[in-house]
C-alpha cells in the first residue's frame, strides 16, 4: 500500500532508504532539456519474491529537442557528484542493503536523470536521518521514521533526532520540548 | 470537522479551459495531499492526480498529464485544478478527495459541461 | 496500470438479500477499498484495507479477500443500501478504481 504521506521534514536533516521495500516506485524525471522516451516507462517498481527482488522497468531520457532514444549509461564518478537528491550522500548504513529481503538497492542512476529523486514509498519502508554538514545530532530516541497504516490513513512516526549548530549552546537532550508527531495525529496508534 | 466545498458547475465552450477550486476546512491544509478524481456522466471513477500542498509537488495519471494542472493556495487552503483544451468528452463531475490514505473525505463535486 | 475488474456490472435483488459483488485486479495488491454512491451524491467510503469497516458503516457490510480476488458482502440488503459501489486499490500508480457494481431493486 502506498504511503499518501511524506517523511517527517526534520530542521537541518536529510533522510535516507538503505532499502527499499517492494512496491516502491521511482518516477522516471529527466533534467532540463530531455524528456522520457516515447512509450518509456512512468516508474521503477521495486518487485520480487522471498529470495530476490529488483527494479522493474528502466527510465529512459531523451534530448527534448531530438527525436534520438538515450541509452542507459552510469554516469562518470564527476557527473555523480553533481547529482543532487533528496537523500542524504554521506555513506551511512545502519541496514547492509543486500541483507534485507524483500527489498531493493538504490537503483543506479540513469542518463540525462533529474536531479531530485522522487520515490513512492509502501507501508512498512523505513527511513534514516542524519544531521547536514556543519551540525550535530541530539538523540532522544532512533533517527528514523516508519510509514505505519491506522485506519486505512498512512503517517510516518517522528524521529527523535535534533540537529544543531556546532556552535550553538543547546538544551540537554531531555529537556527538549517534544516534537507534535507528524500530520498531528497519533503515534502509537498502528492497528485498529 | 473536516469539508471540502467545490466551487460551481460551470458550462465551457470546446477548446477553452476551466478551473475548479476546492476549499478545505476543519483539518491542517498542508498535511494531507488532496486528490482530484473525474465521473463522466453515468460512467466510473477515474484518478487524475494529487498536490502535495506544502511543497506544491504534484503526481498525475499519465492519462491526465496534458489535461489537468492542479495547484493549491496554503493562505485560503485551496486546491484548484484547471483542465485546458476542453473538449465534449471532458464533460464529467469534477471530486477533490483528501488524500493521506483512503478518500475518507470528499468535496460535492463540480460538473463541467464542455458544449458548443 | 492495474484493472479492476467488478461483478456483475449491474445486480438486481430485493430487500432482506444477502449480496456479494466481486473485484478482480490484474495484478497482485496489498488491499481493496470500497466505497458506495448514490446518485448525484460523492462517492462514501465504506470499508478500507480490504475488510475494516468505515466510522459509522452498519455491520451488514464486510469486506474479504486477498491478492487479486476482493468481495464485498451485504448480508441482509436495506432500503438504504441500492447505491453504486466501487472497488479502489492504491497498492501502485495510478490508483484505479473498478468500473463500479449498482444494485437496484429486483
Known amino acids: 500500500e502506498l504511503c499518501d504521506d511524506d517523511p517527517p521534514e526534520i530542521p537541518h536533516a536529510t533522510f535516507k532508504a538503505m532499502a527499499y521495500k517492494e512496491g516502491t516506485m521511482l518516477n522516471c524525471e529527466c533534467k532540463r532539456g530531455f524528456r522520457r522516451i516515447k512509450s518509456g516507462s512512468l516508474y521503477m517498481l521495486c518487485t520480487g519474491n522471498s529470495s530476490h527482488s529488483s527494479w522493474d522497468n528502466q527510465c529512459q531520457c531523451t534530448s527534448s529537442a531530438t527525436r534520438n532514444t538515450t541509452k542507459q549509461v552510469t554516469p562518470q564518478p564527476e557527473e555523480q557528484k553533481e547529482r543532487k537528491t533528496t537523500e542524504m550522500q554521506s555513506p551511512m548504513q545502519p541496514v547492509d542493503q543486500a541483507s534485507l529481503p524483500g527489498h531493493c538497492r538504490e537503483p543506479p542512476p540513469w542518463e540525462n536523470e533529474a536531479t531530485e529523486r522522487i520515490y513512492h514509498f509502501v507501508v512498512g519502508q523505513m527511513v534514516y536521518y542524519q544531521c547536514v554538514q556543519g551540525y550535530r545530532a541530539l538523540h532522544r530516541g532512533p533517527a528514523e521514521s516508519v510509514c505505519k497504516m491506522t485506519h486505512g490513513k498512512t503517517r510516518w512516526t517522528q524521529p527523535q533526532l535534533i540537529c544543531t549548530g556546532e556552535m550553538e549552546t543547546s538544551q540537554f537532550p531531555g529537556e527538549e520540548k517534544p516534537q507534535a508527531s507528524p500530520e498531528g495525529r497519533p503515534e502509537s496508534e498502528t492497528s485498529c | 470537522q473536516v469539508q471540502l466545498v467545490q466551487s460551481g458547475a460551470e458550462v465551457k465552450k470546446p477548446g477553452s479551459s476551466v478551473k475548479v477550486s476546492c476549499k478545505a476546512s476543519?483539518?491542517?491544509?498542508?498535511?494531507?495531499?488532496m486528490h482530484w478524481v473525474r465521473q463522466a456522466p453515468g460512467q466510473g471513477l477515474e484518478w487524475i492526480g494529487y498536490i502535495r500542498p506544502k511543497r506544491g509537488y504534484t503526481q498525475y495519471n499519465q492519462k491526465f498529464k496534458d489535461k489537468a494542472t492542479i495547484t493549491a493556495d496554503e493562505s485560503t487552503n485551496t486546491a484548484y485544478m484547471e483542465l485546458s483544451s476542453l473538449r465534449s468528452e471532458d464533460t464529467a463531475v469534477y471530486y477533490c478527495?483528501?488524500?493521506?490514505?483512503?478518500?475518507?473525505?470528499w468535496g460535492q463535486g463540480t460538473l463541467v459541461t464542455v458544449s458548443s | 496500470d492495474i484493472q479492476m475488474t467488478q461483478s456483475p456490472s449491474t445486480l438486481s435483488a430485493s430487500v432482506g438479500d444477502r449480496v456479494t459483488i466481486t473485484c478482480s485486479a490484474s495484478s497482485s495488491i496489498s488491499y481493496m477499498h470500497w466505497y458506495q454512491q448514490k446518485p448525484g451524491k460523492a462517492p462514501k467510503l465504506l470499508i478500507y484495507t480490504t475488510s475494516n469497516l468505515a466510522s459509522g458503516v452498519p455491520a451488514r457490510f464486510s469486506g474479504s479477500g486477498s491478492g487479486t480476488e476482493f468481495t464485498l458482502t451485504i448480508s441482509s440488503l436495506q432500503p438504504d443500501d441500492f447505491a453504486t459501489y466501487y472497488c479502489h486499490q492504491r497498492s501502485t500508480y495510478p490508483l484505479t478504481f473498478g468500473q463500479g457494481t449498482k444494485v437496484e431493486v429486483k
Open positions: 476543519g483539518y491542517t491544509f498542508t498535511s494531507y495531499r
Open positions: 478527495a483528501r488524500g493521506g490514505g483512503v478518500f475518507d473525505y
